[in-house]
């Protein structure tokens, strides 16, 4: 599974959108979790409403908000007031009983504010050439990179 790299500015909000097959995942709740360590578990941060039909309602845990558009097949997670400690590897998951299927791996990087807006576009020029899309970010300079983890050494 590829990992999306998203960068957001400290103090601002970062919106993550994970898409999925709406039919395949019909009736399943979604969750956002943070991976602890290379081989560690994925610690649940927040999950959608317990009643699947109400999954469109926003659920919050601290500064993280999740909502699921089950018809469009898009679960949206918003990390508000980004802090350095929010940086990490996360997963969007689809829940079925005790099983969790990974929909998307997301690497969140939290950047220092640039000196001024003029510099913002030069924060990071990726060396790898890969498919770039518009960043899924609110009020934030960011890049969105699809890439795969290299093999562990």
């Amino acid at each position: 599974l590829n990992t999306t790299v998203l960068q957001g500015m400290a103090g601002q909000s970062l919106r993550v959108s994970c898409t999925y097959d709406a039919l395949k995942h019909w009736g399943r709740r979604k969750a956002w979790c943070r991976q602890l360590g290379e081989e560690g578990p994925c610690q649940r941060v927040v999950s959608t409403h317990g009643v699947w039909l109400l999954a469109f309602l926003k659920k919050r845990n601290g500064s993280t908000v999740i909502a699921d558009d089950t018809l469009a097949g898009t679960v949206t997670i918003t990390l508000k007031n980004l802090q350095a400690g929010d940086a990490g590897l996360y997963q969007c998951q689809s829940l079925r009983g005790r099983e969790a299927e990974v929909l998307q791996k997301v690497l969140v990087e939290v950047l220092e504010d640039p000196l001024d807006d003029q510099d913002a576009g030069d924060l990071w020029v990726p060396e790898e050439s890969s498919s770039f899309e518009g960043a899924q970010v609110e009020h934030s300079t960011s890049r969105n990179q699809e890439t795969s983890f290299p093999p562990t050494s």
Epitope: V5, Q7, A10, Q35, L36, G37, E38, G40, Q83, A84, G85, A87, G88, L89, L107, E109, V110, L111, E112, D113, L123, W124, P126, E127, E128, R143, Q145, T147, F149, P150, T152, S153
Partner: antibody, heavy 121, light 107 residues
Framework: QVQLVQSGAEVKKPGASVKVSCKAS????????IHWVRQAPGLGLEWMGW????????TSAQKFQGRVTMTRDTSISSAYMELSRLRSDDTAVYYC??????????????WGQGTTVTVSS | DIQMTQSPSSLSASVGDRVTITCRAS??????LAWFQQKPGKAPKSLIY???SLQSGVPSKFSGSGSGTDFTLTISSLQPEDFATYYC?????????FGPGTKVDIK
């Protein structure tokens, strides 16, 4: 064991640039941020910024923005910090340090031995 | 920027003493605080992260506590190898900042 080995001492003239290297071993290089910290003679520690070796993403303290460039070469598990437009007050020992969090910022756990950079005309 | 202050700036102690160093942040940093030990001419050594978690390989005579703005590093029984300068660092908010250091020397 986890180890960071830095390049040797440098003497530079004001206005020049210096590039310090930090070679990592004993762990998955792409899994852990590398921070750069400096210490001027007889003074305390000053954080400069970090690079995420997995993505190449960087951030730096505003004080250094526009003057510091952090890069990495994953094929040889090395990180680099280049400081340009050197001034005499950039004379310091420059350290690289690994963050202990997996692709996260949990505080540094292992430090390089330091690289002395002297800026003098 | 978050200012980190340490007290005392220096202290003299004897082998076997219990030593406490305090670190204060100018604003709340939760538990995003680390402690380091540095000896002259050497690189800093990481002792504590997340305010109270001991780094791997660090002896249990070192302990950390606190949350928010006030933190302490305690050395339960000072040994000859513990005479050094100790720094705290916050990694909650950019730029990550260090305290000015506390020098522990022999009485």
């Amino acid at each position: 064991q986890v180890q960071l080995v830095q390049s040797g001492a440098e003497v530079k003239k004001p206005g020049a640039s210096v590039k310090v290297s930090c070679k990592a071993s004993g762990y998955t290089f792409t899994g852990y941020y590398i921070h750069w910290v400096r210490q001027a003679p007889g003074l305390g520690l000053e954080w400069m910024g970090w690079i995420n070796p997995y993505s190449g993403g960087t951030t730096s303290a505003q004080k250094f923005q526009g003057r510091v460039t952090m890069t990495r070469d994953t094929s040889i598990s090395s990180a680099y910090m280049e400081l340009s437009r050197l001034r005499s007050d950039d004379t310091a020992v420059y350290y690289c340090a690994r963050d202990g969090g997996y692709l996260a910022l949990y505080g540094t756990d292992v430090w390089g031995q330091g690289t002395t950079v002297t800026v003098s005309s | 920027d978050i200012q980190m202050t340490q007290s005392p700036s220096s202290l003299s102690a004897s082998v076997g003493d219990r030593v406490t160093i305090t670190c204060r942040a100018s604003q709340g940093i939760s538990n995003y605080l680390a402690w380091f030990q540095q000896k002259p001419g050497k690189a800093p050594k990481s002792l504590i992260y997340a305010a109270s978690s001991l780094q791997s390989g660090v002896p249990s005579k070192f302990s950390g506590s606190g949350s928010g703005t006030d933190f302490t590093l305690t050395i339960s029984s000072l040994q000859p190898e513990d005479f050094a300068t100790y720094y705290c660092q916050q990694y909650s908010t950019y730029p990550f900042t260090f305290g000015p250091g506390t020098k522990v020397d022999i009485k």
